[in-house]
Interface confidence: low
């Protein structure tokens, strides 16, 4: 039913569509969803609203990073009386609505996950037509993307005093542990320097002084797997060559 009330602060007449028991907006999202890179993930989002019989136009929106201001990654619109939410935006074509906004469900499927998708996502619904109302989740759902290690760069670089150093950068989630093996490092894996956290999911380990020619191997490992890559150091006339 429709309830009319006087707003005494502004002395305006407000008409609000009211329906017990849900007299105010809420959104329900889990704190976190985990999935592996390359797989798909579902971000659940359901809501309650005070307009139980609302059948007008609506827009469903998902944004990334921060609520209210983050970039939209998905948007769809449903016409009055329609249960079909027509997609207007799907970033890189990887986002698809699973839920039915008419049934208070904005759940979203994200395809072909990458580590860059590891962020917080916020669902939002907007009503237009007879009722003008909107609501957005304030805490959002964290999409936690896991990935086996991948070595993204391995190189030999000149150091002062005609020396050489090796750098190995890997990505993965959980961040992989890096270890070097090679001539004069012993047969066992030896992390010469503690890996340092880089940007996002990148980890870099440095071998500060390569004293012998030969093959140096960087191994990256986490709970999901391991990866290795090698460089070869051979010096002639003060130059170095590296192959991976």
């Amino acid at each position: 039913f429709v309830r009319t009330k006087i707003d005494t602060t502004e002395n305006l007449l407000n008409t609000e569509v009211h329906s017990s028991p849900a007299q105010r907006w809420s959104m329900q999202v889990p704190p976190e969803v985990s999935a592996e890179a390359g797989d798909a993930a579902v971000l659940p989002c359901t809501f309650t609203h005070p307009h139980r019989h609302y059948d007008g136009p609506l827009t469903a929106i998902w944004r990334a990073g921060e609520p209210y201001a983050g970039p939209q990654v998905f948007r769809c619109a449903a016409a009055r009386g329609s249960e079909l939410c027509q997609t207007a935006l799907s970033l890189h074509g990887r986002f698809r609505l699973l839920g039915n906004p008419r049934r208070n469900d904005l759940s979203l499927r994200v395809e072909r996950l990458a580590l860059a998708d590891d962020r917080r996502y916020f669902c939002r619904v907007e009503f237009a037509g007879d009722v003008h109302d909107r609501y957005e989740s304030r805490h959002g759902v964290r999409l936690h993307v896991t990935a086996a290690p991948r070595i993204v760069n391995i190189s030999v670089l000149p150091s002062p005093a005609h020396a050489f150093r090796a750098l190995c950068t890997a990505e993965g989630e959980p961040p992989p542990a890096l270890a070097w093996s090679g001539p004069a490092l012993g047969n066992s894996l030896a992390a010469v320097r503690s890996p340092r956290e880089g940007h996002g999911h990148l980890v870099t380990a440095e071998l500060p002084a390569l004293t012998h020619d030969g093959r140096y191997t960087c191994t990256a490992a986490n709970s999901l797997g391991r990866s290795e890559a090698s460089v070869y150091l051979f010096r002639f006339h003060g130059a170095s060559g590296a192959s991976t």
């Epitope: 028991p21 007299q23 957005e136």
Partner: antibody, heavy 114, light 113 residues
């Protein structure tokens, strides 16, 4: 008229389990959360958990996670709460309440005694 | 968990008197998104379930007499009964409606002199 009708009082032995029911009427059962709240004699209120019957999504208070299991039966518009491994600490009145606690059931008294 | 602290634990009043009771939370219940305080007040009479009085700290539930007023923001909230009636004798609970687990205060018992 929105109503929540709860099952009758239960007298149970320590270590046993009991399943309480909360039958909803007057609204679309699958649209709104149902909460469960505990009140020990002469004490305050404790939120136990909630269930969204539309998807069976549940949220539990960590304190009750190993004690309670919530389910919902759409066909009968009934929410259930099972309490397991009962002790005297579980003797209480248990209320079901609609999301936002606008509407409450009358409560079910559970007495654990040998 | 958010802890809700109510005071006093009991109040003895005479009919027609103005009454205030306090509820404090150890974390802010103000949601920056919609600028609402997610604090709810309930009234519970003996042998009955609680009854919703006020939500969003100050919005009176439909059918609740206007002698009941909620106020406050952030972590400090107050329930005021402008002129206590005999039917108001009950226990009043405040509740964190902002984050899970939802938590209640221990209650303020209103008794008649």
């Amino acid at each position: 008229q929105v109503q929540l009708k709860q099952s009758g009082a239960e007298l149970v032995r320590p270590g046993a389990s009991v399943k309480l029911s909360c039958r909803a009427s007057g609204y679309t059962f699958t649209d709104f959360y149902i909460n469960w709240v505990k009140q020990r004699p002469g004490q305050g209120l404790e939120w136990i958990a909630r269930i969204y019957p539309g998807s069976d999504e549940t949220y539990y208070n960590e304190k009750f996670k190993d004690k309670v299991t919530l389910t919902a039966e759409k066909s009968s518009s009934t929410a259930y709460m099972q309490l397991s491994s009962l002790t005297s600490e579980d003797s209480a009145v248990y209320f079901c309440a609609l999301w936002f606690f606008d509407v409450w059931g009358t409560g079910t008294t559970v007495t654990v005694s040998s | 968990d958010i802890v809700m602290t109510q005071s006093p634990s009991s109040l003895t009043v005479t009919a027609g008197e103005k009454v205030t009771m306090s509820c404090k939370s150890n974390q802010s219940l103000l949601n920056s998104g919609d600028q609402k305080n997610y604090l709810t007040w309930y009234q519970q009479k003996p042998g009955q379930p609680p009854k919703l009085l006020i939500y969003w700290a100050s919005t009176r539930e439909s059918g609740v007499p206007d002698r009941f007023t909620g106020s406050g923001s952030g972590t400090d909230f107050t329930l005021t009964i402008s002129s206590v009636q005999a039917e108001d004798l009950a226990i009043y609970y405040c509740q964190n409606d902002y984050s899970y687990p939802l938590t209640f205060g221990a209650g303020t018992k209103l008794e008649l002199k």
